[in-house]
């Protein structure tokens, strides 16, 4: 007897799909070996139709898939658009040849069943409305009309023209005639439920002269659409329930034995297990909506259903759409930190993975907000302006070819705590969710800038120093000038580097930056930070105000600007990757045009496509030492 197990008989009808699950013993070899589906020929040879090695036969092209689920020790063969020619004997198995471990499966595909000539077949989905058409002769024009449902030999009246309605059809069934038609009446049954299915007889008149019509009503529960997604990737449930429920509350629920537990609805309900990683988005005025879930976990696998009802909860007799989600643990998406911790006044550097094949895609970082259906406004992007409230403290550093980019947020406050998403305009599966937890600082920050009231005078020399502890001795120290399109690294001078690391003096580890001579455009935010190669670490920010030599009043009150950065921890920001914009003296003139485009573009990521990356900051006004 074979250790492989599956269904020995599968039957379906033409045009339909089947999904055949084969179970194998849970061993490392079995998990990784070739899986196959082959058709048994009369000569005993089993011809491969599809395998996990990527082989797909001509007759299965565009209509079949084989997916391995090593965590469940199963693989699934999906075959769509069945025809009677698919009827036959098959094997699902494991091994490098088709003679290894296998299980025999018999597939039978039948024609769509036909009903007797006098029976009209109505096929409707749960929650929809059926209109049953009942024809009669002129002689019964003024006779009683009725619709009954066959139950064994009896036929129980559902509704009749004397205004009787069976209690189980109350408010759901109506009998009517259209316009001047004198040979036909109709019965509408709305909010269909599975038990409405069966044979109905409509009748006009009594006795032998009565006119009768048979109607076979089939009420279908939605066949779940199969969705196969990788661990840590994202899934979108596209729900289209029709115009009749356009104004009702919408929901997505997950089936749990007898119930369907609401994950999210448009009335504000949300399952805590999906906090920070779910969005419900209305698509149009016709009731279409989508639900996006990111950061898929193994336990997210299961049956999902979307629906509509004024309560925002599943109700029998209301339209639904269904999916079965499989989560494959063999994921191409790397494991990254799901929780990042910071302290007030400090910074965080968040590494966002993206599909390495799409290094030119636009990268974004957004803040998930719980209000209503959840939303994620973009805070920064490769061609998106930094959102208001994040100026000087948030930047995105792209590292092309590395398969990751870094977002740095500094001057952290407790209000920065929450969920953030990394996303690109490319492969939508690569959306990752990070929870940022900001705690109150209990000690001084690792990086400190002096002077703290940084006011530079035009035409003079201005030096600013960043003190770092010995633990950062071996790391690369840098200064960068923040602008709306990044934080561009400046030439700087590391005074601690002259010393031997053995005798590291905590008080004299300094990296300094000099502006000589100071120009008006030097005004703005500067960051001091540490990094190792492409891995960014701690940063701190300071606002440098620039004033005229002749005037006493500074352009911006430096005390106010740096109070936010240094003295008021509750307003401080986190580590962020930044981009430089217009504060450059000797840049290539072509970049100025790009920067104007960036400034004029809207603040939504998809609207910010202007090109222009300021590159290295070697041309900073004045020289840095």
């Amino acid at each position: 007897q074979s250790p492989i197990f599956g269904p020995q008989d599968v039957s379906s009808i033409e045009g339909n799909s089947v999904s055949i699950t084969c179970y194998y013993p849970d061993t490392s070899v079995n998990r990784h070996t070739r899986k196959y589906w082959c058709r048994q020929g009369a000569n005993g040879y089993c011809a491969t139709l599809i395998s996990s090695n990527g082989y797909l036969s001509k007759e299965y092209s565009g209509r079949a898939s084989l997916i391995n689920f090593p965590e469940n020790s199963t693989f699934v063969i999906n075959i769509a658009h069945l025809t009677q020619e698919d009827t036959g004997s098959y094997k699902c198995g494991l091994g490098t040849t088709n003679r290894g471990l296998f299980f025999d499966v018999s597939l039978e595909v039948s024609q769509v069943p036909e009903f007797p000539n006098d029976t009209h077949v109505y096929t409707k989905d749960i929650g929809r409305t059926v209109t049953i058409e009942c024809r009669f002769k002129e002689g019964n024009a003024h006779s009683k009309k009725s619709l009954c449902k066959k139950r064994g030999e009896a036929c129980e009246v559902v509704i009749d023209s004397t205004e009787y309605v069976d209690p189980s059809y109350k408010d759901r069934a109506i009998l009517f005639m259209k316009g001047t038609s004198r040979d036909i009446f109709y019965v509408n049954i709305s909010h269909l439920i599975p038990s409405d299915a069966g044979l109905y007889v409509c009748q006009a008149g009594e006795g032998p002269s009565a006119d009768k019509n048979n109607a076979d009503l089939q009420v279908l529960e939605p066949e779940p659409e199969l969705l196969y997604k990788d661990l840590r990737s994202s899934v979108t449930f596209e729900c289209d329930l029709g115009r009749e429920v356009a104004n009702d509350a919408k929901y997505l629920c997950r089936k749990n034995k007898e119930t369907c537990d609401v994950i999210i609805n448009t009335l504000g309900k949300r399952d805590p297990a999906f906090e920070g990683r779910i969005l419900l988005t209305p698509r149009d005025d016709n009731g279409r909506f989508s639900v996006l879930i990111t950061g898929l976990r193994k336990e997210d696998a299961g049956h999902y259903q979307c629906g509509a009802h004024s309560s925002g909860l599943p109700q029998e007799g209301w339209p639904v759409q269904a999916w079965q989600l499989f989560v494959n643990e063999e994921s191409t998406i790397p494991n990254s930190r799901s929780v990042v911790k910071g302290v007030t006044g400090g910074s965080v550097a968040i590494v966002c993975p993206y599909n390495p094949k799409e290094s030119s895609s636009l990268k974004y970082w957004c803040h998930w907000e719980a209000d209503e259906n959840g939303r994620c406004p973009v805070l920064v992007g490769t061609q998106a302006l930094v959102q208001e409230g994040y100026e000087g403290r948030l930047a995105l550093f792209d590292q092309p070819g590395s398969g990751a980019y870094t977002v740095i947020l500094n001057q952290l406050t407790t209000q920065d705590s929450g969920f953030y998403w990394c996303l690109t305009d490319g492969d939508s599966r690569w959306r990752t969710t990070i929870e940022l937890q900001v705690a109150e600082a209990t000690k001084k920050p690792d990086l400190e800038v002096t002077p703290q009231n940084a006011t530079a005078v035009i035409g003079e020399t201005f030096t600013i120093s960043c003190h770092y502890p010995c633990k950062f001795y071996s790391q690369e120290k840098y200064w960068c000038k923040w602008s709306n399109d990044g934080c561009h690294i400046l030439p700087s001078h590391d005074e601690g580097a002259r010393q031997s690391s053995v005798s590291c003096d905590q008080s004299s580890q300094i990296v300094s930056m000099t502006l000589n001579p100071v120009k008006k455009e030097d005004e703005g935010w500067y960051w001091c930070g540490v990094k190792e190669g492409q891995v960014y670490g701690e940063t701190t920010a300071i606002y440098v105000a620039v004033e005229e030599r002749t005037r006493g009043s500074p352009h911006i009150n430096p005390t106010d600007a740096n109070a936010r950065a240094k003295d008021a921890p509750e307003e401080e920001a986190m580590e962020s990757s930044v981009r430089e914009d217009e504060n450059k003296a000797n840049l290539d003139p072509r970049l100025f045009a790009d920067e104007r485009e960036i400034q004029n573009a809207g603040d939504q990521a998809q609207e910010n496509r202007a090109s222009g990356n300021a590159g290295s900051a070697g041309g900073q006004s004045g020289s840095s030492k």
Epitope: D9, V10, P194, E223
Partner: nanobody
Amino acid sequence: EVQLVESGGGLVQTGESLRLSCAASGRAFSDLRMAWFRQVPGKEREFVAAVEWRGSSRYYYSADSVKGRFTISRTSPKGETYLQMNGLKPEDTAVYYCAAVSPVVGDPRNSDTYNYWGQGTQVTVSS
């Protein structure tokens, strides 16, 4: 809530046949797996056979020990489920349970995946 009621058990001679029925009342499902398990006192429940209705497709499973002798069938997604047992042997003696799960999940042989169970019907095969 779904109730499952088994019937058709009894005492038969080796080689004879029995037909067990499982009637389901309550909700009707179209995405449904119905199964038969059996249990001998002091032993774990053993999978016998299962049938799945998913949309208009049906999937039939059976244990190696009963292949070719026992057949599971179901007239419609809302009808009764039957276990036709031919060529009965003394080792088939057990309490037979009907089980159901909707939506269809997990390995049909695993009793933990089922959320509805009947009370059981005794089948005794004497030699």
